[in-house]
């Protein structure tokens, strides 16, 4: 059998096989050693007994999408049946005091591979034997502690495979310079040691994406905005836009990145090299936000141009263009655009990313202030608690609720939270009455809210002993 017979039905075209050469990977036309690495079809009854105590689940993730030319990293994590874990020696053991369906186990080991490898014979002085090999016959790499690595992972994509010895979690990085744009499939088959052979325990596949568009995300934050994820913001308060470029392999670390903003409110284009920008909308309505990100990234060099006609002078290499634009699909590096060749083969290509959002601007509570505090005199001669009136003003829309959070003087330990609907007059002036149990200094956080906004003000107040002569003090506002 060949690798492609074992590892999946995805058969790339001859063109793809030729153009998608992954560094360090091998062709799936190679032979697979079925004696050492048996192959079981889906539904084969042997899967049921491939692991003691249940099935092992493999979880495959990647940091896709990847900008073409960058590295994409795949991670596989094995999830063992309940109460099982891998120990420091790579053996699979039962967790202490953990009960599964079979109850508590007397044997601490699920698989004691250390004992197996010490018993194994037929090895020469290098520790090499005919069974310490991958499915294609290549020997295991003998770095320190390799004997504690008891799982064999075979990654397969684009007509190529990569073999890795590992523990219950492995990572593999692939450079995408030669990968065709678009969605691709990665498949992983996992084997475990079994005496002098191996047993399949899990198979998993996941789609990853290679793109020539810079993956861009924008987070938006605005003070007093009640829900930052609903893309509804408040008029007359700045919104902070923060651009996050998904570049886990730091491919664009040395690139100059330009951000071109259009806020959709006829304020024109705003160009910046900073990933954050503030913008204030002064009208209510719905606006289309557009961002274009441009970065000069390392890219493939074009083929050399045909020799120039004798009648024209040859331009020097120093004056040739060093960058070109890419916006067309197809295999990376196959864009016959504005290209240049430089002697050391380090060419640059302009990559673009786009972000578009429709945001709604509404009225909101812009500001809230406590303008007065009054100790309410109670009819009882020496009550245990104090009633205090906070006279509050606000700007913007009509609040519908008021919350007071009363806490210790550091404003960290909440003692009491009270929220209630509020009826506010046209002037946005209201009085909030709250009870304070006992004298002392309190931190008061007062918020006014409506459907879309939440405005906060804080103050420290000093509630005196209930001597009528003691005045109420605003300790700090």
């Amino acid at each position: 059998k060949r690798f492609h017979d074992v590892l999946g039905n995805e058969r790339p075209s001859a063109y793809m096989r030729e153009h998608n050469q992954l560094n360090g990977w091998s062709s799936d036309e190679n032979d697979w050693n079925e004696k050492l690495y048996p192959v079981w079809k889906r539904g084969d009854m042997r899967w049921k007994n491939s692991w003691k105590g249940g099935r092992v689940q493999a979880v495959l993730t990647s940091d896709s999408p990847a900008l073409v030319g960058s590295n994409i990293t795949f991670a596989v994590n094995l999830i063992f049946p309940r109460c099982q874990k891998e120990d420091a020696n790579g053996n699979i053991v039962y967790e202490k005091n953990c009960r599964n369906e079979a109850g508590l186990s007397a044997d601490p080991y699920v698989y004691n591979w250390t004992a197996w490898s010490e018993d194994s014979d037929g090895e020469n002085g290098t520790g090499q034997s005919h069974h310490n090999v991958f499915p294609d016959g290549k020997p295991f790499p003998h770095h320190p502690g390799w004997r504690r690595w008891n799982f064999i992972y075979v990654f397969h994509t684009l007509g190529q495979y990569f073999q890795k010895l590992g523990r219950c979690s492995v990572r593999v990085s692939v450079n995408t310079a030669n990968v065709t744009l678009g969605p691709q499939l990665m498949e992983v088959t996992v084997y475990r040691r079994h005496g002098r052979a191996y047993v399949p325990i899990a198979q998993v596949k996941d789609v990853y994406v290679v793109t020539d568009q810079i993956p861009v995300f924008v987070t938006m934050f605005q003070k007093n905005d009640r829900n930052s994820s609903d893309e509804t913001f408040l008029k007359d308060l700045p919104i902070m836009f923060d651009v996050l470029i998904h570049d886990p392999s730091h491919f664009l670390n040395y690139s100059t990145i330009n951000y071109k903003w259009s806020f959709g409110d006829n304020t024109g284009l705003f160009v910046s090299t900073n990933h954050t920008v503030n913008h204030t909308y002064v009208l209510n309505g719905t606006f289309s936000l557009n961002l274009t990100v441009k970065a000069a990234a390392p890219g493939p060099c074009p083929p050399p141009p045909p020799p120039p006609r004798p009648s024209k002078p040859t331009p020097s290499l120093a004056t040739t263009l060093k960058s070109y634009d890419s916006n067309t699909p197809g295999p990376a590096g196959d864009n016959p655009l504005e290209l240049s060749r430089i002697p050391d083969e380090n060419c640059q290509i302009n990559r673009y990313g786009h972000f578009q959002a429709t945001i709604t601007i509404v009225e909101g509570i812009l500001e809230v202030n406590i303008i007065q505090m009054t100790d309410v005199l109670m009819p009882v001669p020496w009550p245990e608690s104090s009633l205090i009136d906070f006279v509050v003003t606000c700007q913007g829309s009509i609040p519908t609720e008021v919350c007071t959070i009363i806490s210790d003087p550091t404003c960290e330990i909440t003692q009491n939270t009270v929220c209630s609907p509020v009826d506010v007059d046209e002037m946005c002036l209201l009085t909030v009455r709250r009870t304070f149990n006992g004298s002392g200094t309190y931190c008061v956080n007062l918020t006014l809210g409506d459907d879309t906004s939440l405005a906060l003000t804080s103050t420290l107040i000093s509630v005196p002993d209930r001597d009528p002569a003691s005045p109420l003090r605003m300790a700090n506002s």
């Epitope: 608690s385 519908t400 009270v418 459907d451």
Partner: antibody, heavy 116, light 110 residues
């Protein structure tokens, strides 16, 4: 002069539905929260539901939660109460009231009778 | 069973001063404004006192409200026969997220 006029009451069978309306005039309806309060025959007042000026915040008494829906049409200066899955214990005079932290103006009420 | 507790009845003779109590907890009366409503026989309720002790315009100053801790009271001085009605206290309850009323007090002018 503030006026609140309820309508839509009547006799309905248990499990049935009814929609009450409250036409408001004499004040800026769009700037005021509104509420419904009911009173069963010979009994005390029971708050039913309240809604913010824009309709974005709504509150309900536990006894009606999931069955009643409060809404408003600010362009028509009208408050509504959609009552579904009505029970005998919902029989009451339903009052429309202005505001929600205190009820400063009340309508004359509309009688809802739930009976088979 | 009402969240706010009022005496079911109260009485007085014309010219007398009568007080109706309303007791609750810190989640309602203790931290929210109390209102008082008057309901004359066969009519809709009417706001008498708001924000613990404030009178809306048109309400005679014979009616006054006060609050101490988790209790509130309505005082009617110079009692008149037209004051014969049901009186309800009410407040927002921040724990229940609901407006709560007392069970009502029937005032009889003897």
């Amino acid at each position: 002069e503030v006026q609140l006029l309820e309508s839509g009451g009547g006799l309905v069978q248990p499990g049935g539905s009814l929609r009450l309306s409250c036409a408001a005039s004499g004040f800026t309806f769009i700037r005021r929260p509104m509420s419904w309060v009911r009173q069963a025959p010979g009994k005390g007042l029971e708050w039913v539901s309240s809604i913010s000026h824009s309709g974005g915040s709504k509150y309900y008494a536990d006894s009606v939660k999931g069955r009643f829906t409060i809404s408003r049409d600010n362009s028509k200066n009208t408050l509504y109460l959609q009552m579904n899955s009505l029970r005998a214990e919902d029989t009451a005079v339903y009052y429309c009231a202005r505001k929600w932290s205190t009820f400063d103006y009340w309508g004359q009420g509309t009688l809802v009778t739930v009976s088979s | 069973q009402s969240v706010l507790t009022q005496p079911p009845s109260a009485s007085g003779t014309p010219g007398q001063r009568v007080t109706i109590s309303c007791s609750g907890s810190s989640s309602n009366i203790g931290n929210n404004y109390v209102s008082w409503y008057q309901q004359l026989p066969g009519t809709a309720p009417k706001l008498l006192i708001y924000a613990d002790s404030q009178r809306p315009s048109g309400v005679p100053d014979r009616f006054s409200g006060s609050k101490s801790g988790t209790s509130a009271s309505l005082a009617i001085s110079g009692l008149r026969s037209e004051d014969e009605a049901d009186y309800y206290c009410g407040a927002w309850d921040s724990s229940l997220n609901a407006y709560v009323f007392g069970g009502g007090t029937k005032l009889t002018v003897l």
